[in-house]
C-alpha cells in the first residue's frame, strides 16, 4: 500500500551535440510486469510530455521512430537519452513511472531534473 | 480550447444496459488516461473506472467490476462506458475526467445524468 | 483502498474570512499524489490544487494547499462570494482513486 517514490538526478549539463542522459529509478511497491515511462518538461509551471515508452520488465525500452528520447532498462532503473537539445530546452525534465500491470495501478513522480543546455559556439570561418 | 462532453445519458430500467460517451477535444486523446466518475442525487464524487492511453489497461471500483466496461477509440477521440445490469443505486451524474501530465484530474466534462428506475 | 476523511462536513463563514479545510487518510499518501477540488451547485468539479500545494492554471494565489503523510490542509486566505461551494480530496497515488465525502462552505 505504499506509494511509489521516483529518483533522479537534481542537475545534468547536456554535450557540446545537445545529448543528455539521466538515471531514473523507481522503487516498487509491487511486481510490476508492464511499466510506463514518461518524461515531462516543465516550464513556468506548465507540464508538456517530451516522450513516453511503455516496456515489459525484462524487456527493453522502446520509443516511437520520432522521439527525441532513447533508453534502456534494468530492474527498477531506466536510462534515459534526450537528444536534439538546444539552449532554448533548458529547463525541468520529469520522470513518471506508471505501473500498468497488474492490479493496483500506482503513480510516480520524480522531483525533476534540471537539464542544462548551452549552443555551441559557431566555429569561425578559415580562410585557405 | 480542451474540452470533454459526455452524452447518452437517460433513464432506464433496473437490468438493462446504456453506453455513455465522451467525445474529447483540444489535446492528444491517446496521450492520456481517462476516467468516469459518478455523483449521485445530493452525494460526493466516487470514482467508476480508468482507461489507459492505448486502451489495454483497465480499472474499475469494486461496485461496477463485472458490470461495466470502460473503453476509447482513438481515432475518434472517444471514451466509452458500457453500463449493464443497471441497478438503482447505479443513478447519479456520469463525468468523464483526464488525467492530466502529472496524474490530477484536469479536465472534466459537464456530465450526463442516468436515472435507474422502473 | 485509501480512505480519505473531510472535516468538517460543513463549514459556516462569512466573505472576506479564512477557510480552513481538513483532509485525512486511512494511510500515508505521498504529497505528490493530493488534490482538491471546487464544485459548485450544477457543475462539474473543478481542479484547484495537485501535488498537495501547488495551484492548477487560472487558480487564484488565495487558494493554498499544504500537509503530508496523513493530514492535508486546503486554505483559502480571503473568501470570496464564488468562493462558497463544496470541496473534495482526492488520492491519485494508486487505484483505486479515491475521494473524500467534502467540505461545504457556506454563507453564515
Known amino acids: 500500500c505504499k506509494a511509489m517514490h521516483v529518483a533522479q538526478p537534481a542537475v545534468v549539463l547536456a554535450s557540446s551535440r545537445g545529448i543528455a542522459s539521466f538515471v531514473c529509478e523507481y522503487a516498487s511497491p509491487g511486481k510490476a510486469t508492464e511499466v510506463r515511462v514518461t518524461v515531462l518538461r516543465q516550464a513556468d509551471s506548465q507540464v508538456t510530455e517530451v516522450c513516453a515508452a511503455t516496456y515489459m520488465m525484462g524487456n527493453e525500452l522502446t520509443f516511437l521512430d520520432d522521439s527525441i528520447c532513447t533508453g534502456t532498462s534494468s530492474g527498477n532503473q531506466v536510462n534515459l537519452t534526450i537528444q536534439g537539445l538546444r539552449a532554448m530546452d533548458t529547463g525541468l525534465y520529469i520522470c513518471k513511472v506508471e505501473l500498468m500491470y497488474p492490479p493496483p495501478y500506482y503513480l510516480g513522480i520524480g522531483n525533476g531534473t534540471q537539464i542544462y543546455v548551452i549552443d555551441p559556439e559557431p566555429c569561425p570561418d578559415s580562410d585557405f | 480550447q480542451v474540452q470533454l462532453v459526455e452524452s447518452g445519458g437517460g433513464v432506464v430500467q433496473p437490468g438493462r444496459s446504456l453506453r455513455l460517451s465522451c467525445a474529447a477535444s483540444?489535446?492528444?486523446?491517446?496521450?492520456?488516461?481517462m476516467h468516469w466518475v459518478r455523483q449521485a442525487p445530493g452525494t460526493g464524487l466516487e470514482w467508476v473506472a480508468v482507461?489507459?492511453?492505448?486502451?489495454?489497461?483497465?480499472y474499475y471500483a469494486d461496485p461496477v467490476k463485472g458490470r461495466f466496461t470502460i473503453s476509447r477509440d482513438n481515432s475518434k477521440n472517444t471514451l466509452y462506458l458500457q453500463m449493464n445490469s443497471l441497478r438503482d443505486d447505479d443513478t447519479a451524474v456520469y463525468y468523464c475526467?483526464?488525467?492530466?501530465?502529472?496524474?490530477?484530474?484536469?479536465?472534466w466534462g459537464q456530465g450526463t445524468m442516468v436515472t435507474v428506475s422502473s | 483502498e485509501i480512505v480519505l476523511t473531510q472535516s468538517p462536513g460543513t463549514l459556516s463563514l462569512s466573505p472576506g474570512e479564512r477557510a480552513t479545510l481538513s483532509c485525512r487518510a486511512s494511510?500515508?499518501?505521498?504529497?505528490?499524489?493530493l488534490a482538491w477540488y471546487q464544485q459548485k451547485p450544477g457543475q462539474a468539479p473543478r481542479l484547484l490544487i495537485y501535488?498537495?500545494?501547488s495551484r492548477a492554471t487560472g487558480i487564484p494565489d488565495r487558494f493554498s494547499g499544504s500537509g503530508s503523510g496523513t493530514d492535508f490542509t486546503l486554505t483559502i486566505s480571503r473568501l470570496e462570494p464564488e468562493d462558497f461551494a463544496v470541496y473534495y480530496c482526492q488520492q491519485y497515488g494508486r487505484s483505486p482513486f479515491t475521494f473524500g465525502p467534502g467540505t461545504k462552505v457556506d454563507i453564515k
Open positions: 475526467a483526464r488525467a492530466g501530465d502529472l496524474g490530477a484530474f484536469d479536465i
Open positions: 483540444g489535446f492528444t486523446f491517446s496521450s492520456y488516461g
Open positions: 494511510q500515508s499518501v505521498s504529497s505528490s499524489y
Open positions: 482507461i489507459w492511453y492505448e486502451g489495454r489497461n483497465k
Open positions: 501535488g498537495a500545494s
